[in-house]
Interface confidence: low
């Protein structure tokens, strides 16, 4: 069977696969998925191995009409380097020469010039080219070469191994060599796979079962960190609790070097952030951290000083922490939008069973502040979603010079956010450097500001406006109409319509279907409409819906189904990658994220067209 | 950081034409939609037209005689009014992506 890194390498004019038949002789046969002289995978971002012979593809010289055959994978040689061109040739690095299919004569693949029919590969039973099932780096844990990659293959004790193996051991732990000749430089590592024995790389909190991996004798930048604990189905460390971080505080006071955590302000726009997405709401940083030189934008926890937060450029090479398990956080169900009829009294503004209201003239301290809303039957806004601090933004008319007070203190516990009203912090959206939390001046309250409404920790003695939220009532005053301008069954955000096709359908029936109604398949402009899509069926059972996106037109181009351009995109994680298809929006807790899937795959999808007659919640004017 | 700046604003009679701009600064990049929005006193603010990627729209009351239309290059927007009837007078808002932006507003006034 074939795992998922190998594949058949298939000529579509001939209809056959390639066939490494010797180490000197590479040709083509019918193809067939069981034989082993036919499968071949990347071994590294630019070397092709022979399954069967732990060979590389490779040529004598970089010139025209030459035979490809085996060779010793050799990471550094010029004449195993292979790159994808334009659509499905392959071809040597740097080079306008190409995989070719050989003729008449010569039965053996060949390295040509031409870039015809015959110097054109897919991977068998795909439309893919060959890179659609590229290398990706497999970094070591443990053993001794501070967590460098598998080289694959690696011989050990002469023989090749392309896999991780238990050779040479008795407990069953996979291992790799991190060179190729493991016989002669004993470099080597634990691979970051389920093993017998593998859950003892990992130290569970009793009190939370939260998992930790500490990997202190590895030096990995923090993007290849990252990636090590994301292999494991982990992430980097985030730290939302007092109790986790005095946890961990023990787990690492016999070491002295930096480990890099998830924490993070790599996002251009945004202040300090968790990379599996956790509220930033505990603050432990080393005294004069974070540091606002350009750059340093990684955490490291610093064992040696109490284990207390360090930023430092992200290319540094350190050890890290990994985090796996029930997250730390109180669970806590925040209903959707439509799952709640909102009536609210005068003045206020409904959204998903609550209300709001933004005090902008009568300027507050924040005490004050929250003492006016609780009056009001309310507290100061809390904000558990993007669609939540969307919906303020877009709906309540939100202007991007507002610096207004929100529920956000750490009044109670220095160092540690809670909102007012009680509810767990489960989201937060910090300004580019924020929290700053200086020193010099207490800044234990937060104000919403900017034109994205992202929040800074302040003084809570300044007077500014506010924003305050109560529970809506079941029966009120006045029930706002908000879906005028669409018909029955669609639901209204700004200038559009929406509506849920129920039916699963392949992209193509989803498109007709939309077509059907006057409409299309959605197109996603910018953030605020994906946070209102994310909210509409984000919370859904199904696992995906359909947008208009795809590449279906011009492989490797993805251009939405009606003439508008793609000025934004929102790709899950290894999204889009080089896989051709059709473009479905996440739910669950991906919610909203973009994947490529198979345009014949059946999803629900989200048709849209423009309201008629659109209006716009009234926006208090300053 | 976006700024819009509305300009064109001003008295005439019904029946008359105005143009108005709306001159966008800043990271102008960033924007995919516009729209022009009016209040009139004591009113809802409502949308009089929007326009995003090549598509315009119009709300029924304005319809056949006003016409929105951007100018990429001067990064401009404009709303070409004919007809003009006093139920049009109102301040007159630019916007840009769904509301995170706002102009000051400009004000016209359609009275004999």
């Known amino acids: 069977l074939l795992d998922t890194r190998q594949f058949l390498i298939y000529n579509e004019d001939h209809k056959r696969c390639v066939d490494a038949v010797s180490p000197s002789a590479v040709q083509t046969a019918a193809c067939n998925q069981d034989a082993e002289s036919q499968k071949f995978r990347w071994v590294s971002e630019s070397q092709i191995m022979s399954v069967a012979f732990k060979l590389c593809l490779g040529v004598p010289s970089k010139t025209d009409w030459v035979a490809i055959t085996l060779y010793a994978c050799d990471s550094k040689s010029e004449f195993q380097k292979w790159e994808c061109k334009n659509d499905t040739l392959l071809g040597i690095k740097g080079e306008d020469l190409f995989f070719n299919y050989g003729n008449r004569q010569e039965k053996n693949i060949m390295l040509y010039k031409g870039s015809g029919l015959w110097s054109r590969w897919k991977i068998y039973g795909t439309t893919d080219n060959l890179c659609s099932r590229g290398y990706e780096a497999m970094y070591t844990l443990l053993g001794n070469a501070n967590g460098a990659t598998c080289a694959f293959p690696f011989k050990f004790e002469n023989k090749w191994y392309a896999d991780c193996t238990s050779a040479g051991r008795s407990d069953g732990w996979l291992w790799c060599g991190t060179t190729t000749d493991y016989d002669t430089d004993k470099l080597f590592g634990y691979c970051p796979l389920k093993f017998e024995g593998s859950e003892s790389l990992w130290n569970k909190d009793p009190l939370t079962s939260v998992s930790y991996q500490i990997n202190s004798k590895s030096a990995l930048t923090w993007h290849q960190a990252r990636k090590s604990c994301q292999q494991q189905n982990a992430e980097l460390l985030s730290i939302t609790e007092i109790h986790e971080q005095t946890y961990l505080t023990g787990l690492t006071s016999s070491l002295t070097s930096g480990l890099w955590i998830g924490l993070n302000s790599l996002s251009f726009n945004s202040g300090w952030q968790w990379s599996d997405r956790s509220p930033f709401r505990y603050l432990n940083w080393l005294p004069g951290s974070p540091s606002a030189e350009p750059g340093k934008s990684c955490v490291s926890l610093n064992p040696g000083k109490n284990a207390k937060w360090e930023n430092l450029e992200c290319v540094q090479k350190l050890g890290y922490i990994c985090k796996k398990g029930n997250t730390t956080l109180n669970s806590f169900v925040i209903p959707s939008e439509s799952d709640v009829p909102t009536h609210c009294p005068s003045q206020w503004w409904p959204y998903a069973g609550h209300c709001y209201k933004i005090h902008r003239d009568e300027k507050k301290i924040q005490r004050d502040a929250l003492t006016t809303c609780r009056k009001e039957g309310g507290d100061l806004t809390s904000i558990h979603t993007i669609e939540e601090l969307d919906f303020i933004i877009s709906q309540l008319g939100y202007e991007p010079n507002d610096e207004l007070w929100i529920g956000l203190n750490d009044i109670k516990i220095q160092m540690y956010f809670e909102w007012s009203d009680g509810t767990p912090v489960t989201f937060t959206k910090w300004l580019r450097g924020e929290p700053s939390h200086e020193n010099n001046r207490q800044e234990d309250c937060v104000v919403m500001k900017g034109k994205d409404g992202y929040w800074a920790d302040r003084g809570c003695e300044w007077p500014l406006g506010y924003i305050c939220k109560m529970k809506s009532r079941s029966q009120g005053p006045e029930i706002v109409e908000v879906e005028k301008g669409c018909r029955k069954g669609w639901k209204k955000h700004h200038f559009y319509c929406y509506m849920i096709g129920h039916t699963l359908s392949t992209f193509a029936e989803a498109n007709q279907t939309c077509n059907n109604e006057n409409a299309y398949l959605t197109t996603i402009e910018d953030r605020y409409e994906q946070a209102f899509l994310t909210s509409f069926v984000g919370l859904r059972p199904e696992k995906y819906f359909w947008t208009g996106l795809s590449d279906i037109q011009t492989k490797g181009t993805f251009q939405w189904t009606i003439e508008e351009e793609v000025r934004f995109t929102h790709w899950n994680s290894d999204m889009p990658g080089r896989k051709p298809g059709c473009v479905a929006m996440r739910t669950g807790i991906a919610g909203g994220l973009w994947d490529v899937l198979k345009c014949d795959e059946k999803a629900k999808f989200v048709c849209k067209h423009w309201a008629e007659g659109v209006t716009h919640p009234p926006k208090p004017t300053t | 950081q976006v700024q819009l700046q509305e300009s064109g604003g001003t008295l005439v009679q019904p029946g008359g034409s105005l143009r108005l701009s709306c001159a966008a600064s800043?990271?102008?990049?960033?924007?995919?939609?516009m729209g022009w929005y009016r209040q009139a006193p004591g009113k809802q603010r409502e949308l009089v037209a929007g326009?995003?990627?090549?598509?315009?729209h119009y709300a029924d009351s304005v319809k056949g005689r006003f016409t929105i239309s951007r100018d990429n290059a001067k990064n401009t927007m404009y709303l070409q009014m004919n007809g003009l009837k006093p139920e049009d007078t109102a301040v007159y808002y630019c916007?840009?992506?769904?509301?995170?932006?706002w102009g000051q507003g400009t004000q016209v006034t359609v009275s004999s």
């Open positions: 326009i995003t990627g090549g598509n315009t």
């Open positions: 800043g990271s102008t990049f960033s924007i995919n939609n």
């Open positions: 916007n840009a992506n769904w509301g995170a932006y």
